[in-house]
Interface confidence: low
């Protein structure tokens, strides 16, 4: 019942041309390229492309033909190469064309850079737009995979194909529309936020195969299919983890198109084996297939079996434990895990981990000892602190949330994480906190079965972010080593780090405190970045400042901003009394 | 994969009609969308009408109200009815079908609009 076993193909590259059609297979080319070359022009990777797809349908017409028969690695490989300008660009990167395939490619894995030195995508009006789509709608889209892919070069390609499809949707409605704007600009909105989550989604993904390895992503992979599909057999959910392993592993290896093929064989099974797997496909299994494959992925979860046994049973109780666990270890621990994740759909994946990981080193422990089963007897009372932990944790950051609103939690929080890991840069420290506060909105809503899940998963997704951003420029021992010993104990790691008492308070710079008439013409949330970029700065220089302190002085601030974007005369106004703000902060911090 | 045949172009006057067929045969359950595009010798290859499994249609401005396109599921047919033809109307136009992107082509069909 293997997917992917496929017959051996003379070409490679024809198989997945003819496999994708020549659309995808020039789009998918288009986001390889640009996810490894980040810097170069998008007329560059056009033509790379071209060039590429002009070759594949030469071995379409004749897979015999000279060159056919390599590698697409070889192939890509070969044609980044060719990029003239790549040393001056992208300086030691260069020296990845001087090896042989395989490290050729792992070496331009290495240089991917999760924030690469880009210009912020600016929004044109709307008109502009329009009109740039109906004249080379193909180049419009082309344009938007390009400026996607090369700032987010993990992300899940097929996916992106999807966003593209959203994407071209949106404009072909709403650029008939009589009001363009309001009908675009909402869409381009929701597209613009799920993109960036989708995006730090499958980073983790990423993370988990390249800093922990398959068992690891393999774990996490049972967790969440076992809760997702807990009417399935463990057989089937181990042939769909196997399956979406390969799949990811392709994707974040940059071998899109393998991947991109291979994720549409696993929907196409999914949905042949509907009955065997998931009672809730049925909807998502009549769409076309990119929408298929990202509804199969979004799918609720299934409702539990009645009357599913004790866990305890075959798990603690029986003599057969520690034969079971020696005889095949991974397979025992990842019935556990299924067993376990299918009756808690309540649970965050990242916990069951923790559960499976104490259960392992339980039998570790015990089935070397003069009577196993009075030693692992217990094992189901160690879970209970391990649990109770992130319900706790959910509870307090809830009621808080609950009380400050949005903006003010995320306040809370960029005090809390600046004041913990001080080294990291101010913007990391931002963009971290703020995504770390969105879980308020996120998740506080749901009923108690329900926010567990949310707000624990969503937090390691954005937990790697900063492990990800910080592992470009090391500043912190405290956060490499969260982020480095064990990935489902980032988050408790991070929980625990208290105030960092070896920081040195920064040196006070009144310009960073200085601010211009140009705020007043910000969005809300640039100029909420602009307060908490302060906020984080104050911070830096009195790590030891209250709550009430930091409260009075960002009231102060507010109240400065609202002044003087009111003043006819607003850069005197932030000038002058700018300089007030700035003396009466030093003041009340005592600086 | 997906064979798409154009046929009906050839030579009319300006302000003259025209009606383009596209017949589509092999894995045809797969298509969702439909669409004629035209490349004039010399230009960009341009979007000239989509239409949706569903029925939903769009045009680019500079054809609206003059063509139109339809599909004949049945006969796994698509159509381009072309009224007010004028000069720069002038180019191949070819049939295109996909799932997601009309990522399959027909060989074209000449539209020559000349007095």
């Known amino acids: 019942r293997g997917v992917f076993r496929r017959d051996a193909h003379k070409s490679e590259v024809a198989h997945r041309f003819k496999d994708l059609g020549e659309e995808n297979f020039k789009a998918l080319v288009l986001i390889a390229f640009a996810q490894y070359l980040q810097q170069c022009p998008f007329e560059d990777h056009v033509k790379l492309v071209n060039e590429v797809t002009e070759f594949a349908k030469t071995c379409v017409a004749d897979e015999s033909a000279e060159n056919c028969d390599k590698s697409l690695h070889t192939l890509f490989g070969d044609k980044l190469c060719t990029v003239a300008t790549l040393r001056e660009t992208y300086g030691e990167m260069a020296d990845c064309c001087a090896k042989q395939e395989p490290e050729r490619n792992e070496c331009f894995l290495q240089h991917k850079d999760d924030n690469p030195n880009l210009p912020r995508l600016v929004r044109p009006e709307v008109d502009v737009m329009c009109t740039a789509f109906h004249d080379n709608e193909e180049t419009f889209l082309k344009k938007y995979l390009y400026e996607i892919a090369r700032r987010h070069p993990y992300f899940y390609a097929p996916e992106l194909l999807f966003f593209a499809k959203r994407y071209k949707a949106a404009f072909t409605e709403c650029c008939q529309a009589a009001d363009k704007a309001a009908c675009l600009l909402p869409k381009l909105d929701e597209l613009r936020d799920e993109g960036k989550a989708s995006s730090a989604k499958q980073r983790l993904k990423c993370a988990s195969l390249q800093k922990f390895g398959e068992r690891a992503f393999k774990a996490w992979a049972v967790a969440r299919l076992s809760q997702r599909f807990p009417k399935a057999e463990f057989a089937e959910v181990s042939k769909l983890v196997t399956d979406l392993t390969k799949v990811h592993t392709e994707c974040c290896h940059g071998d899109l198109l393998e991947c991109a093929d291979d994720r549409a064989d696993l929907a196409k099974y999914i949905c042949e084996n509907q009955d065997s797997i998931s009672s809730k496909l049925k909807e998502c299994c009549e769409k076309p297939l990119l929408e298929k494959s990202h509804c199969i992925a979004e799918v609720e979860n299934d409702e539990m079996p009645a009357d599913l046994p004790s866990l305890a049973a075959d798990f603690v109780e029986s003599k057969d434990v520690c034969k079971n666990y020696a005889e095949a270890k991974d397979v025992f621990l990842g019935m556990f895990l299924y067993e376990y994740a299918r009756r808690h759909p309540d649970y965050s994946v990242v916990l069951l981990l923790r559960l499976a990981k104490t259960y392992e080193t339980t039998l570790e422990k015990c089935c070397a000892a003069a009577d196993p089963h009075e030693c692992y007897a217990k094992v189901f009372d160690e879970f209970k602190p391990l649990v109770e932990e992130p319900q706790n944790l959910i509870k307090q950051n809830c009621e808080l949330f609950e009380q400050l609103g949005e903006y003010k939690f995320q306040n809370a929080l960029l005090v809390r994480y600046t004041k913990k890991v001080p080294q990291v840069s101010t913007p990391t420290l931002v963009e971290v906190s703020r995504n770390l506060g969105k879980v308020g909105s996120k998740c506080c809503k749901h009923p108690e079965a329900k926010r567990m899940p949310c707000a624990e998963d969503y937090l390691s997704v954005v937990l790697n972010q900063l492990c990800v951003l910080h592992e470009k420029t090391p500043v912190s021992d405290r956060v490499t080593k969260c982020c480095t010993e064990s990935l489902v104990n980032r988050r408790p790691c991070f929980s625990a780090l208290e105030v960092d008492e070896t920081y040195v308070p920064k040196e006070f710079n009144a310009e960073t405190f200085t601010f211009h008439a140009d705020i007043c013409t910000l969005s809300e949330k640039e100029r909420q970045i602009k307060k908490q970029t302060a906020l984080v700065e104050l911070v830096k220089h009195k790590p030891k400042a209250t709550k009430e302190q930091l409260k009075a002085v960002m009231d102060d601030f507010a109240a400065f901003v609202e002044k003087c974007c009111k003043a006819d005369d607003k850069e005197t106004c932030f000038a002058e009394e700018g300089k007030k703000l700035v003396a009466a902060s030093q003041a009340a911090l005592g600086l | 994969q997906v064979q798409l045949v154009e046929s009906g172009g050839g030579l009319v006057q300006p302000g003259g009609s025209l009606r383009l067929s596209c017949a589509a045969s092999g894995s045809i359950e797969s298509i969702n969308r439909m669409a004629w595009y035209r490349q004039a010798p010399g230009k960009q290859r341009e979007f000239v009408a989509r239409?949706?499994?569903?029925?939903?249609?769009n045009y680019p401005d500079s054809v609206k109200g003059r063509f139109t396109i339809s599909r004949d599921n049945s006969k796994n047919t698509l159509y381009l009815q072309m009224n007010s033809l004028r000069a720069e109307d002038t180019a191949v136009y070819y049939c295109a079908a996909g799932p997601v992107w009309e990522q399959f082509w027909g060989q074209g069909t000449l539209v020559t609009v000349s007095s």
């Open positions: 239409i949706s499994k569903g029925g939903s249609t």
